[in-house]
Amino acid sequence: SIPWNLERITPPRYRADEYQPPDGGSLVEVYLLDTSIQSDHREIEGRVMVTDFENVPEEDGTRFHRQASKCDSHGTHLAGVVSGRDAGVAKGASMRSLRVLNCQGKGTVSGTLIGLEFIRKSQLVQPVGPLVVLLPLAGGYSRVLNAACQRLARAGVVLVTAAGNFRDDACLYSPASAPEVITVGATNAQDQPVTLGTLGTNFGRCVDLFAPGEDIIGASSDCSTCFVSQSGTSQAAAHVAGIAAMMLSAEPELTLAELRQRLIHFSAKDVINEAWFPEDQRVLTPNLVAALPPSTHGAGWQLFCRTVWSAHSGPTRMATAVARCAPDEELLSCSSFSRSGKRRGERMEAQGGKLVCRAHNAFGGEGVYAIARCCLLPQANCSVHTAPPAEASMGTRVHCHQQGHVLTGCSSHWEVEDLGTHKPPVLRPRGQPNQCVGHREASIHASCCHAPGLECKVKEHGIPAPQEQVTVACEEGWTLTGCSALPGTSHVLGAYAVDNTCVVRSRDVSTTGSTSEGAVTAVAICCRSRHLAQASQELQ
Amino acid sequence: QEDEDGDYEELVLALRSEEDGLAEAPEHGTTATFHRCAKDPWRLPGTYVVVLKEETHLSQSERTARRLQAQAARRGYLTKILHVFHGLLPGFLVKMSGDLLELALKLPHVDYIEEDSSVFAQ
């Protein structure tokens, strides 16, 4: 029957005896940087062109015997997972292979760089349709490898990489840590993170999503009709490269930002058991398992948003953390989070002509994270309106006063070390949705956007008794753009968006006591674009 | 995902002198940096990627590489330019002694230098 991994990524309407979704990536070329491959394997023959590129180090050990089938093992399997006739994701995609890993599966950063340069030069010499580059490899953090990936991505190439098999933070590895690359962790048939011996899949904020990566049947280089099961984040990345090829074949004009947002949007949500990840990484790791979209027609009418976490600020008093959106994305809101609860909020600020989200640590704090809500909003014009601390008992408030601008997010930032929990909670006056309200000692920042057909509304969920977590979600057809807490008191650890749900975390209930100050309200700003919906209907 | 002030080992070598009478001395106050893999067993000392500033042309990259070879030779060191990058990043790959790093960091147009390291199939 259909291999479990193909079934997992396939929407029910495609599930048949033969997994053959329409438009199997035929307009897309996938470059594979890996070991040598057995291109005459029945699973991939005629689909993979072996380029003359080879840049590999000598094999270790004097007694190493080069055995063709072993040299080709990793690359052949991955080529099969991407485009194989029977066990492949994008059965119509054509591939080109570059050899950057030796017979022991080892390569160098420099060899990989030269390979990426080769792809760029090939693209310039003979421009074709959309390009996907699969990098099923990992090394230590490398500034130069990340920079090369960034340049290639900005030239319109989609790069997909393995998160790494070190059961560690993916941000410590390259190219997994490159923001422009789509970084993929591995899950198994039970949707659990993959364990590989004593190690396993990497995790953390540098992972974009997970995909099947355990017991994946694919072409074996032992013979031209041999198949074998392999496991790893390479296999997971190959699934996403295949899905990307399918999506790009259906919509060749998709940008990297649009593709990444769609990959996230169509993923299965909240199916991974997060207990497998270290506690401090759970909130940072996306609970997403990749899947094909249910239709090959674009979902262009939707307002897509994703959450981007910054690196940890570190514990020094004036430490800050910055979260950035991709070049084609709009920063629609900014929030912050600190495990100790000691933070001085967050603000949106311009940096290099683009808005970024900056979170501020507080004295005695162990550090903060900035959390950006990054959205695809064509023709958007966004600005930040700030109100300084009001010092009045009513608290600080700011609204979007420009005609046609709507509120997409609220941030608050304070200079004092402790806002003090003994101030009465500030409540938003009803009937004023276009307004941010915060503590009187905080400055408040409103993200105000104008875009064709953009409409937003505020949704709140308050709990009178103290709780560790309060959530509020946007309903079907609406997208979460902003997530914040009312009031901005110090027992709130922070707020962040998980898919379409706004999560506000508070200190452990046992330490706050069940006084009225324990009340926490989660505030979600939910938006939709009627303009995008109309445009989509006109196309159909 | 990871900012450039990320989690890796960085060795900053300040530009202190104008030795070798460089014709194109680096802009005042800029400091080229040296990076290497934080995971020691994965390091490949002896091979370095010299990354030049963004707008550097291929001819300047080649000139900078030749200059490094000439200055190294004057100090009795053999170097080998393995590859000149252009198309994605300006720069070059050089096989040389780590003793020459301080010299290389003072070359014109140099943004940073990274020691080569291993990558692995996942």
Epitope: E18, H41, R42, E43, G46, G84, R85, D86, A87, I217, A219, S220, D222, C223, T225, C226, F227, V228 | -
Partner: antibody, heavy 118, light 107 residues
Framework: QVQLQQPGAELVKPGASVKLSCKAS????????MHWVKQRPGQGLEWIGE????????NYNEKFKSKATLTVDKSSSTAYMQLSSLTSEDSAVYYC???????????WGQGTSVTVSS | DIVMTQSHKFMSTSVGDRVSITCKAS??????VAWYQQKPGQSPKLLIY???YRYTGVPDRFTGSGSGTDFTFTISSVQAEDLAVYYC?????????FGGGTKLEIK
Amino acid sequence: QVQLQQPGAELVKPGASVKLSCKASGYTFTSYWMHWVKQRPGQGLEWIGEINPSNGRTNYNEKFKSKATLTVDKSSSTAYMQLSSLTSEDSAVYYCARERPLYAMDYWGQGTSVTVSS
Amino acid sequence: DIVMTQSHKFMSTSVGDRVSITCKASQDVSTAVAWYQQKPGQSPKLLIYSASYRYTGVPDRFTGSGSGTDFTFTISSVQAEDLAVYYCQQRYSTPRTFGGGTKLEIK
């Protein structure tokens, strides 16, 4: 659905030739290799050879190299096997079977019974 | 050529019994082995591919195992309709070769 249609029977004289057909439908004919298998009455299965319909590439069992010739007609999605210089030893049921890389010979024709008799 | 040997030409069993058919390759064939069922007067039908994977629609009482040179096909609880000849086949190299077949007879 996938189908491989073969004529039911062929009666041929010793020394003559016969061209067996196998018409494929329900899938992309050029995507998968086509195999031919012989089965004599009461005996086991014997592999004759295979052909790649997309480029006409063939592989034969040495034993059948001078006996069988495999061809395809892409326009009609039909595979052919010509058997020459027939003797009574060639009397058998001949099956065509589609082979997928992973799933092996997953669809078989009903077989053509060839009888060599004067 | 790789020779595939099915040691039993016939096996007699009763409904509900567990039965295992073995197949030995003359050289390492990795997991490139398929098992087919042929009922009287019918074409062969694929049951198992890649030594251990059950093909679409095949009841789960049929299982396959093995790699290298030794392979086993098992029916966990024989049904009357399982009366047939079972063949193993190696797909490791050309010429493809089949085992001689094992005829399963129901007592």
